[in-house]
């Protein structure tokens, strides 16, 4: 029983340290983000940025991501499309 408790304690400590290291690693990776808005049904991110989300005008909730850098709002007669664009900054 003592051995089991010791193993559990060690495992817990490993988890704590690992979790802390992962958190620090994630924290040190900065995300640079910007928003792009276009008239019509497409909005494109600059080079090096990836689409992380899209928004559509005319209360349209149907969209997809094209060629990795472009938001496409799928409703007819779209008046505007927005893209949230992010890239990792070490």
């Amino acid at each position: 029983k003592t051995l089991c408790s010791m193993e559990e304690a060690i495992n817990e400590r490993i988890q704590e340290v690992a979790g802390s290291l992962i958190f620090r690693a994630i924290s040190s990776i900065g995300l640079e983000c910007q928003s792009v808005t276009s008239r019509g049904d497409l909005a494109t991110c600059p080079r090096g940025f990836a689409v992380t989300g899209c928004t559509c005008g005319s209360a349209c909730g149907s969209w997809d991501v094209r060629a990795e850098t472009t938001c496409h709002c799928q409703c007819a007669g779209m008046d505007w499309t927005g893209a949230r664009c992010c890239r990792v900054q070490p």
Partner: antibody, heavy 117, light 110 residues
Framework: EVQLVQSGAEVKKPGESLRISCKGS????????INWVRQVPGKGLEWMGM????????KYSPSFQGHVTISTDKSVSTAYLQWRSLQASDSAIYYC??????????WGKGTLVTVSS | QSVLTQPASVSGSPGQSITISCTGT?????????VSWYQQHPGKAPKLMIY???KRPSGVSNRFSGSKSGNTASLTISGLQAEDEADYYC??????????FGGGTKLTVL
């Protein structure tokens, strides 16, 4: 190495149909738009339209909408530009170009189309 | 769809600097900082020289630079060399997610 290999020169008569091709290699074909650009010899460049090879969603310049059709076959990494009824004014060099974000980064060598009776 | 306005021709002597302008509207050049510039030698396909207004692709000489003010973008070539003689085209993404080109500028190196 990114390459866009275009089909050879064509000589056609007015009213005939035509499809020219552009095969992409050296990159993931479905991750980039393919654009078509027209150049009448001795004149400037005109953007015709672009297509997403993933599902062939196309966007056209108002100047070319309805006169040409842009399509792709992603299984063979190839894009196409097609006319149902050619006119003499379609005589030009046609470039296929990879679109990366806001710019056109890799160009094919062009296909010369001559339409003459 | 109207093209962007470029001078038909410019010229300069080796070693000099030249600037080519590209004027559009608030719906294209002025609406985005996403003007690109292309060089085309006779009988060849165009080549991307500047993207996103002022950035150079790898392999393009730092003698080429781009800028923008309002609805006008500019390409500057410094230390002009014989091999720079070519046609230059500006292009802008538009607020309708289409692209438009300038009419082209013929650069002559005297």
């Amino acid at each position: 190495e990114v390459q866009l290999v275009q089909s050879g020169a064509e000589v056609k008569k007015p009213g005939e149909s035509l499809r020219i091709s552009c095969k992409g290699s050296g990159y993931t074909f479905t991750n980039y738009w393919i654009n078509w650009v027209r150049q009448v010899p001795g004149k400037g460049l005109e953007w015709m339209g672009m297509i997403d090879p993933t599902d062939s969603y196309a966007k056209y310049s108002p100047s070319f909408q309805g006169h040409v059709t842009i399509s792709t076959d992603k299984s063979v990494s190839t894009a196409y530009l097609q006319w149902r009824s050619l006119q003499a004014s379609d005589s030009a060099i046609y470039y296929c170009v990879r679109g990366y974000s806001y710019d056109l980064d890799y160009w094919g060598k062009g296909t010369l189309v001559t339409v003459s009776s | 769809q109207s093209v962007l306005t470029q001078p038909a021709s410019v010229s300069g002597s080796p070693g000099q600097s030249i600037t080519i302008s590209c004027t559009g509207t608030s719906s294209d050049v002025g609406g985005y900082n996403y003007v690109s510039w292309y060089q085309q030698h006779p009988g060849k396909a165009p080549k991307l020289m500047i993207y996103e207004g002022s950035k150079r692709p790898s392999g393009v000489s730092n003698r080429f630079s781009g800028s923008k003010s309002g609805n006008t973008a500019s390409l500057t070539i410094s230390g002009l060399q014989a091999e720079d003689e070519a046609d230059y085209y500006c292009s802008s993404y538009t607020t309708r997610s289409t692209r438009v080109f300038g009419g082209g500028t013929k650069l002559t190196v005297l």
